[in-house]
Amino acid sequence: FSPLRRISIKILVHSLFSMLIMCTILTNCIFMTMNNPPDWTKNVEYTFTGIYTFESLVKILARGFCVGEFTFLRDPWNWLDFVVIVFAYLTEFVNLGNVSALRTFRVLRALKTISVIPGLKTIVGALIQSVKKLSDVMILTVFCLSVFALIGLQLFMGNLKHKCFRNSLENNETLESIMNTLESEEDFRKYFYYLEGSKDALLCGFSTDSGQCPEGYTCVKIGRNPDYGYTSFDTFSWAFLALFRLMTQDYWENLYQQTLRAAGKTYMIFFVVVIFLGSFYLINLILAVVAMAYEEQNQ
């Protein structure tokens, strides 16, 4: 080994070197949180870039750049260091017009903390491993969601457009003429039934066990879907989103109540199956895979 390489190896394995890098990263993170940094922080920025460059040079001299098994670029953690340095010099010395997008990459410096703190390295390693192992579970999840989304599409397509419409219209008004002139929320409230505090017209259905309209109103299928049109089973993609919402239990009881009111109470069976299979089984299967991957990484 050349004297330069020997010195580089000594520096690299020294605990103070790791401490210096860790302190630099943490200080850099503090400086990045500043809203309106003063002018002198520019020089501090250069210092940080210099320290990161020095760290990478030490690693390259000690391990080699890319030829050989244990060289600098063969370690994925060093890719992050390399990218951080490249972007630091790019944003500083190359005129790229609007560099605000490139400046975003400075945030990657915070990720350098992972490669320095051993515990974090283990957790992130487990996370990456679990993502690899999750591929099969993800395929199963997407398949199950797709199947139920197709069932939902067949059962509830258009149902969430059912609304309670006012029966006592003016003599020359028709449903179509009203829908053509409706503009504001106030207009809608004039012709459709709204429960107090609700932002959507009352849903209803045409089966005996579905929601019925109050006196003076009749159930029609018109207008948009609830929640600004985002809640529906009208297309496969919307149905898939609704199923994903059920699986993650994201305010799922509202979707459940809306659908049951529009389609009928019988369809609770669909929701029971989806919640048991999607929410209880698949979510826990995903968690089990992550736990297994973490256990393996620890060993």
Partner: nanobody, 124 residues
Amino acid sequence: EVQLVESGGGVVQPGGSLRLSCAASGRILRIGYMRWYRQAPGKQREFVARITDDSATGYADSVKGRFTISRDNAKNTVYLQMNSLRPEDTALYYCEALVTASVRGGSIHSGTYWGQGTLVTVSS
């Protein structure tokens, strides 16, 4: 497809009576309001009477007390009982309904439907 068919029109003497009926057919799920209109030759169409699905009724001032609107939900039919007919009641009587029906491969549609009309002539 939803169809409204009027029947019961004809020639009647002043002071006489007629009963018009309007039957809706198709894969009907719900009928909201049903209304009768009339159009005399050379005049604009005017509203006669209406009935909602909970049987609330309304009439034009010119027919109040003489005409009675009713409906049979089981048969999807609306009736207009016309008593004490006058020559100015001569017109083509149309029925209109707000219908929600299952159309085109099972999808549900709500809309306003009209009949072809039935002619009522009051003449001595």
